[in-house]
Interface confidence: medium
């Protein structure tokens, strides 16, 4: 049985003989109906009307009307994207005259559904202080004190200290809101590798080859394992501390439930997913009475172990 | 041109330590901007990465969850190669082993050189 | 882990044609962190792709990569006799783990 579709919610846009057609809602797979899309608004293949059609999947295309945004004149800036149309998710770069930029340090907008995000114009930036580092165990040796945006200095590491990556040496940026980063120079036997890889989890971001010292990564476990520990693991000293463990769901399946004549209380699931230290209700099949204690019915899920209830 | 050369026996047997050398020649194994690996390709389970060491200012190992508990990768610098170790085998450690480099930055895993691989079978 | 899904398994396609093969990731993957390898029997896998797009040293204009969060593919514009093999994608941005691979085979 192929799923009908019902009335067309055209954001932005709407049905022509929009009124006359709404009865006849919903409609089969298969169907063709033409609509319009609204002022700053328009259809994937770039008109103001198209056709929306009844698939297996619901409404194609599944966004009808796509916003449209024009390229302002930027003062300050670069003109070659000038009275360009852009449409609801694309980005372009802004380029800025020398001293001017986006906003906090952006370098491209992108056309959204309200329009521009954020809007494209070229504010006058701040520069960046020599001042304003602070560098434990190394040093800058350039002679500068005052640094224009997107200038790049580099700064070196006493013997026996590194950066993030192990090098000797790095480089920080001026940027928007001041420098890129603080320059980071630290005993390199306090850094640590990737954070250990657990069972039935991963770790929330990309993994990095070295981590400085205090570095903090988030783990989450595989849907119905349950996060036993902290869900963070911090480096310190060279060692991660304790990671988390993903403990083993309890899966209630169809198969044991009839072996031992049972069934779910309140519910019908074939399959039934618990985690440890959920109580699971069970109850006697029709025709069926019970073998084993009152409190057996009412089991407790254990790291994957759950003890079933008989009735004969 | 840089090379990796694979050495090590061709048969294991259960419960016994798998041991296989992996020589460096045009690259150091304590370059700051590589890691040193071995990954293992078998019918049942495709290519799996086992794990890699590499220096950073200090040595880091890095192993696979699914053979955490029973490898361990040396770098040996006097004679520029590195090692892997996997003890307490099973026929289904049956594969094919190679050792490869790894030349991305600090975020990035991907393997630009391989040796030739070594076909280890466990059995009795 | 991320589970790499290659599609089709096997694919027959005469020298001249354009490949197009897939690698879909059981949760997003960022374009940075995938990379192709080709590999011909008895040998070792070969690099072509990494960061999703950028080719690595050496190989055809031909090969392109492409795609974002858990959709990638593979693209041989122009296959030549050389291009039949196993082709592979691989994720490394949280642990690293290979997909099954794809049989490119002469049609």
């Known amino acids: 049985q192929v799923k009908p579709c019902d009335f067309p919610d055209i954001k932005h846009g709407g049905l022509f003989h929009e009124n006359m057609r709404r009865p006849y809602f919903p409609v089969a797979v298969g169907k063709y109906y033409s609509y319009y899309c609204d002022e700053h608004f328009e259809t994937p293949s770039g008109s103001y009307w198209d056709y929306i059609h009844c698939t297996q999947n619901g409404w194609s295309p599944a966004v009808p009307c796509l916003r449209k945004c024009y390229f302002p004149y930027l003062e300050n800036g670069y003109n070659q994207n000038y009275g360009r149309k852009f449409v609801q998710g694309n980005s372009t770069e802004v380029a800025c005259h020398p001293g001017y930029g986006l906003p906090k340090a952006q370098t491209t907008v992108t056309c959204t559904e309200k329009g521009w995000s954020p809007t494209p114009r070229c504010i006058r930036v701040r520069t960046c202080s020599k001042s304003d580092i602070e560098i434990e165990n190394g040093f800058i040796s350039e002679s500068s004190s005052i640094y224009i945006l997107n200038k790049e200095i580099q700064y070196k590491c006493k013997p026996g200290y590194a950066t993030a990556d192990g090098n000797s040496s790095g480089s920080i940026t001026c940027l928007q809101n001041g420098w890129s980063a603080q320059p980071i120079c630290i005993n390199s036997s306090e850094k640590c590798g990737p954070p250990p890889p657990i069972s039935n989890g991963d770790t929330t971001s990309f993994l990095l080859k070295v981590y400085v010292p205090q570095s903090r990564v988030e783990y989450q476990c595989q849907p119905y394992y349950e996060l036993q520990g902290s869900n963070y693991v911090t480096c310190s000293n060279g060692e991660w501390s304790e990671p988390p463990r993903c403990i083993h769901p309890c899966i209630i399946t169809e198969e044991n439930m009839n072996k031992n004549n049972i069934k779910l209380k309140g519910r019908s699931d074939r399959k039934y997913y618990a985690k440890t230290g959920d109580t699971i209700e069970f109850m006697c099949k029709l025709g069926y009475n019970a073998n084993t204690s009152i409190l057996s019915f009412q089991a407790v899920c254990r790291e994957g172990i759950v003890e079933y209830p008989r009735c004969e | 041109q840089v090379q990796l050369q694979q050495s090590g026996p061709g048969l294991v047997k259960p419960s016994q330590t798998l041991s296989l050398t992996c020589a460096i020649s045009?690259?150091?194994?304590?370059?700051?901007?590589?890691?040193w690996n071995w990954i293992r390709q078998s019918p049942s389970r495709g290519l799996e990465w086992l794990g890699t060491?590499?220096?950073?200012?200090?040595?880091?190992?890095v192993y696979a969850v699914s053979v955490k508990s029973r490898i361990t990768i040396n770098p040996d610098t006097s004679k520029n190669q590195f090692s892997l170790h996997l003890n307490s085998v099973t026929p289904e450690d049956t594969a094919i082993y190679f050792c490869?480099?790894?030349?991305?930055?600090?975020?990035?895993?991907?393997?630009?050189?391989w040796g030739r691989g070594t076909l280890v079978t466990v059995s009795s | 882990e991320i589970v790499l899904t290659q599609s089709p398994g096997t694919l027959s396609l005469s020298p001249g044609e354009r490949a197009t093969l897939s690698c879909r990731a059981s949760?997003?993957?960022?374009?940075?962190?995938l990379a192709w390898y080709q590999q011909k029997p008895g040998q070792s896998p070969r690099l072509l792709i990494y960061?999703?797009?950028s080719r690595a040293t050496g190989i055809p204009d031909r090969f392109s990569g492409s795609g974002s969060g858990t959709d990638f593919t593979l693209t041989i514009s122009r296959l030549e006799p050389e291009d039949f093999a196993v082709y592979y994608c691989?994720?490394?941005?949280?642990?690293?783990?290979f997909g099954g691979g794809t049989k490119l085979e002469i049609k």
């Open positions: 490869t480099r790894d030349r991305g930055d600090l975020l990035h895993w991907y393997f630009d050189l």
């Open positions: 045009g690259d150091s194994v304590s370059s700051n901007s590589a890691s």
């Open positions: 060491t590499y220096y950073r200012s200090k040595w880091f190992n």
């Open positions: 949760q997003s993957v960022s374009s940075s962190y």
């Open positions: 960061g999703a797009s």
């Open positions: 691989q994720q490394y941005g949280r642990s690293v783990t």
